[in-house]
Amino acid sequence: QKSSIEKCSVDIQQSRNKTTERPGLLNCPIYWQQLREKCLLFSHTVNPWNNSLADCSTKESSLLLIRDKDELIHTQNLIRDKAILFWIGLNFSLSEKNWKWINGSFLNSNDLEIRGDAKENSCISISQTSVYSEYCSTEIRWICQKELTPVRNKVYPDS
């Protein structure tokens, strides 16, 4: 039995997979900040987790996926206010009783030290210093990501 949050995540991911392939993104678009091979957009409005997920989708992007602790630290370095929380693309899967990224993979327990409970309707936020489990209905900011594609010997129009 999938929760409504899980269904929303799956639906949006599937619709993203169905969209036509676009040329590689060579540079970050205006307003997006480059962090290594990603472009990040920090929202300045607030939303529950599923609305944040949907907003990133409309921007042809996804909620932030964090590969490891190193990437977490570099992302946190871009957060300038101690008190502000941002949703990322990780929520608790009730059916699998584990933290699950929106790309379908599970959280490696060594990657993030989460403060708070792992339970139904819990989603993950990050601050300048920590990682928190919050009710998914909490309205906070969020971070979208686009992957930069290294493209060689090809010239594409402006992305």
Partner: antibody, heavy 116, light 107 residues
């Protein structure tokens, strides 16, 4: 209600640097993008650039080599510097809150004339 | 850069009439990232529409936006005396550019 107020000299000599400050009241400058836009009878409305905290700026490609936008969160202000000005830079300069591409709050504008 | 061309340059109408303003882009505007503003003499522009069709806070429902790709329209269903002004479109899909404006004047 967020309010923005531009301030700075109304007259700048050619080849000098135009400097303007925008003071934000009724809300925090933190966490938002803030832009400068100018308006001339000849070229109409022209976006100059934005600042986000102090970590990110972007400028109109046609002005990039001459523009610097900075922010002072402690004073709730952000500033514009435009170097090597000519008569073509004479315009009404507006500061605005930038909703990542469109502008929901504007200052009332300040006329800057470039003349010797 | 994306060039926005607004037409007509001037629209002469009477209060109560319907106004249809056009904004055409030189290339497709990504994700319908287009906004409309109203400007009165001596004032700053005022945001009316963003995302091609979403009304900004406090904007009356007689203002509506539509379109996608390269063709966008601002419609004022029934002109009120305070609606006579200059209207600008602006795209934010690829850098940021404004149209040249359409003046809506009293006939």
């Amino acid at each position: 209600q967020v309010q923005l107020q531009e301030s700075g000299p109304g007259l700048v000599k050619p080849s000098e640097t135009l400097s303007l400050t925008c003071t934000v009241s009724g809300g925090s400058i933190s966490g938002y993008y803030w832009s400068w836009i100018r308006q001339t009878p000849g070229k109409g409305l022209e976006w100059i650039g934005y600042v986000y905290y102090s970590v990110s700026t972007d400028y109109n490609p046609s002005l990039k080599s001459r523009v610097t936008i900075s922010v002072d969160t402690s004073k709730n202000q952000f500033s514009l510097r435009l170097s090597s000005v000519t008569a073509a830079d004479t315009a009404v300069y507006y500061c605005a809150r930038d909703e990542t591409g469109y502008f929901d709050y504007w200052g009332q504008g300040t006329l800057v004339t470039v003349s010797s | 850069e994306i060039v926005l061309t607004q037409s007509p340059g001037t629209l002469s109408l009477s209060p109560g009439e319907r106004a249809t303003l056009s904004c055409r882009a030189s290339q497709s505007v990504r994700s319908s990232y287009l906004a409309w503003y109203q400007q009165k003499p001596g004032q700053a522009p005022r945001l009316l529409i963003y995302g091609a069709s979403s009304r900004a806070t406090g904007i009356p429902d007689r203002f509506s936006g539509s379109g996608s790709g390269t063709d966008f329209t601002l419609t004022i269903s029934r002109l009120e005396p305070e609606d006579f002004a200059v209207y600008y479109c602006q795209q934010y899909g690829s850098s940021l550019t404004f149209g040249g404006g359409t003046k809506v004047e009293i006939k």
